[in-house]
Interface confidence: medium
């Protein structure tokens, strides 16, 4: 008799794929544009990335460091009107893209939370949550919560408002902290809160260190849903050398939780390569004309247009991973088991019941390595086969779809492999 199927877990929309942050509308659209009407025209691009949610803004009125001139219910006219926002929501909904609004109050100022007037600001946030929920947003983000006194209790109250409106609404909190204990204390009092932090930001050194960080985090947070990013707002290139971008894309898309990216992460957008551009929000490179300041500074392979035409580009990899992440049960909500694969490597299995299973092997080092996969680390329910099919490699040149013998697995420097194999009873 066939074994009984495991009951599927309840899945919220943010469990089904990546979130895409557009913190600076002007930088994202470029060419002196940067409003809600223009963003609406970019939704097809977001659809092509298969992202599930757009984290937008902040876009509310905020005069730097002035509480009285900060109105969370009003859209800054530079970004457009409420009706432009409404129109964006409607278009996004038709494309199955959820919209999360960033309500970090003093986003133009020194202290995001006006440290001397916390209670006033907290009341404004409560009113804003009610208002924007009625207006149709799918969730909220608040950043820099390390600057918010009594953050845990405020977050719990805001979470109650958000979830009280609908279980389908999401609250994201962001912190610059990379300290696991601080992160856990924020999570403890807030069930269902999605927290973005700098926890993984110094993970780029070795596979062992990354494995240790990921497994510590997953063990400490138990079975709660988590998110994966390298910071609450910044680009991957702020933390990683170019050669590790593909590896991290593969890892973020295949760990159990919601991957969160900033605009430009999909093309390896790097402020350092664009003289004069701010580190936190460089102009998005749609094509070679997007950065006219220095002629010749931008080559086609740095742009959306150029990378869209190249199946071996970072953008093409992002799209493929995003597609897999949103449709494979084992990647959507499968169990996670990390195991030893040798020095410099991080490897893990994702599996769900009798569905196709996935093996991820990541080489963080700058030398080629043979993987010694220690299957003995794995529980019986997640045993390794002798061979697995190569779904994709972060490096060009591998023959995709071909079966690889796991005992003889060799990885190039900075290479990541995503392999698939069937469930075997």
């Amino acid at each position: 008799r066939a074994p009984r199927c495991r009951e599927l877990p309840a899945q919220k929309w943010w469990h089904t794929g990546a979130l895409y942050r557009i913190g600076d509308l002007q930088a994202f659209q470029g060419h002196g544009a940067g409003n809600l009407a223009g963003l609406k025209g970019r939704l097809d691009y977001l659809s092509s990335l298969k992202v599930k949610g757009l984290v937008l803004g902040p876009i509310h009125k905020n005069q730097k460091d002035d509480v009285a001139q900060t109105d969370l219910l009003q859209i800054d006219p530079n970004f457009g009107s409420k009706e432009d926002f409404d129109s964006l929501l409607q278009s996004a909904k038709k494309k199955s893209i959820r919209v999360i609004l960033d309500l970090t109050p003093n986003y133009r100022g020194e202290n995001s939370w006006f440290s001397t007037q916390v209670d006033t600001v907290a009341t404004k946030v409560k009113d804003a949550l009610e208002f924007w929920l009625q207006a149709g947003v799918d969730g909220f983000q608040v950043r820099d919560i390390e600057n918010l006194k009594d953050a845990s209790s405020f977050l719990a109250e805001w979470q109650n408002i958000t979830k009280g409106f609908s279980e389908d609404r999401l609250l994201i909190a962001g912190t610059n902290s990379s300290d696991l204990q601080q992160i856990l204390s924020l999570l403890e009092s807030n069930k269902d809160l999605l927290l973005t932090s700098s926890y993984l930001s110094d993970s780029g050194s070795t596979g062992e260190h990354t494995k240790s960080l990921v497994t510590q985090y997953l063990n400490a947070t138990g079975n709660r849903w988590c998110s994966w990013s390298l910071s609450q707002a910044r680009l991957l290139t702020s933390f990683l050398p170019a050669q590790l971008l593909r590896l991290y894309q593969l890892m973020l898309f295949t760990l159990p939780g919601t991957p969160v990216f900033s605009y430009g992460d999909e093309i390896g957008l790097d402020a350092a390569a664009l003289p004069g551009q701010p580190m936190e929000a460089p102009v998005m490179l749609w094509d070679e004309s997007s950065f006219p300041d220095i002629p010749g500074a931008v080559s086609a392979n740095m742009t959306v247009k150029g990378q869209s035409e190249d199946p071996g580009s970072l953008l093409s990899l992002f799209r493929r991973l995003s597609d897999q992440r949103s449709k494979e049960r084992s990647l959507l909500h499968g169990d996670f088991h990390a195991f030893s694969a040798g020095p410099g490597l991080f490897s893990y299995i994702r599996h769900w019941d009798q569905n196709e299973r996935f093996l991820v092997v990541l080489n963080f080092g700058d030398v080629g390595l043979s993987a010694g996969l220690q299957a003995s680390d794995l529980p019986a329910s997640a045993s390794l086969p002798a061979k697995a099919d190569l779904l994709l490699s972060t490096q060009p040149g591998r023959e995709e779809g071909s079966p690889l013998e796991l005992e003889r697995l060799k990885l190039e420097p900075h290479e990541g492999l995503l392999l698939r194999f069937p469930y075997a009873a």
Epitope: A37, P77, S81, K82, D84, S87, Q90, A135, G136
Partner: antibody, heavy 120, light 107 residues
């Protein structure tokens, strides 16, 4: 409370032009588009187009592209629609309308209508 | 353009009756369907937006339902003040289009 006050009834000759107004009050004028809708006697409603008072951007029904010109004056919180080359087909009640901020393209607030009669 | 069809152009009912008015779109409009009431003096009011959401101030005897291309408005306990013409409107795609209207009368 939100109000849209339209100008009074107009009698015009064929071939002439006329300009009607819609004065908004009770909300921030630049936050919402002003839409215009036509209703001929005993007939259904037809959407003409809208203007974004903030940017003066307009979008209109192809059918009215050469007939209606939409403008707005931020200083007086007033939107205008000019109809040109009038014929008897333009005899109708014209409404201005505004959406609610709620998520859905519906017209929550309507003016009382301006009756236009085109007759020689 | 999307065509909106209200097959019943007029309808007679008694006070207290439950009345249903239907509306069909020429294609799937993803629930972006609104209902308006136009009184004999020309005043237009929004009743229902996004298929089933009641606009503020509208009595709960009005309700909406439907999906895809087929939608309906129901008045559960007809009152004298409900005598009016009812229009459906799609907000899915520009240009926005309205149905031909259903005139409700007391028999």
């Amino acid at each position: 409370q939100v109000q849209l006050q339209q100008s009074g009834a107009e009698l015009a000759k064929p071939g002439a032009s006329l300009k009607m107004s819609c004065k908004a009050s009770g909300y921030t004028f630049t936050d919402y588009y002003i839409h215009w809708v036509k209703q001929r006697p005993g007939q259904d409603l037809e959407w003409i187009g809208y203007i974004n008072p903030n940017s003066a951007y307009t979008d209109s029904n192809q059918k009215f592209k050469d007939k209606a010109t939409l403008t707005a004056d931020k200083s007086s919180n007033t939107a205008y629609m000019q109809l040109s080359s009038l014929t008897s087909e333009d005899s109708a009640v014209y409404y201005c309308a505004r959406k609610g901020h709620f998520y859905a393209p519906s017209f929550a607030y309507w003016g009382q209508g301006t009756l236009v009669t085109v007759s020689a | 353009d999307i065509q909106m069809t209200q097959t019943t152009s007029s309808l007679s009912a008694s006070l207290g009756d439950r009345v249903t008015i239907s509306c069909r779109a020429s294609q799937d409009i993803s629930n972006y369907l609104n209902w308006y009431q136009q009184k004999p003096d020309g005043t237009v009011k929004l009743l229902i937006y996004y298929t089933s959401r009641l606009h503020s101030g509208v009595p709960s005897r009005f309700s909406g339902s439907g999906s895809g291309a087929d939608y309906s408005l129901t008045i559960s306990n007809l009152q004298q003040e409900d005598i009016a013409t009812y229009f459906c409107q799609q907000g899915d795609t520009l240009p926005y289009t309205f149905g031909g209207g259903t005139k409700l009368e007391i028999e």
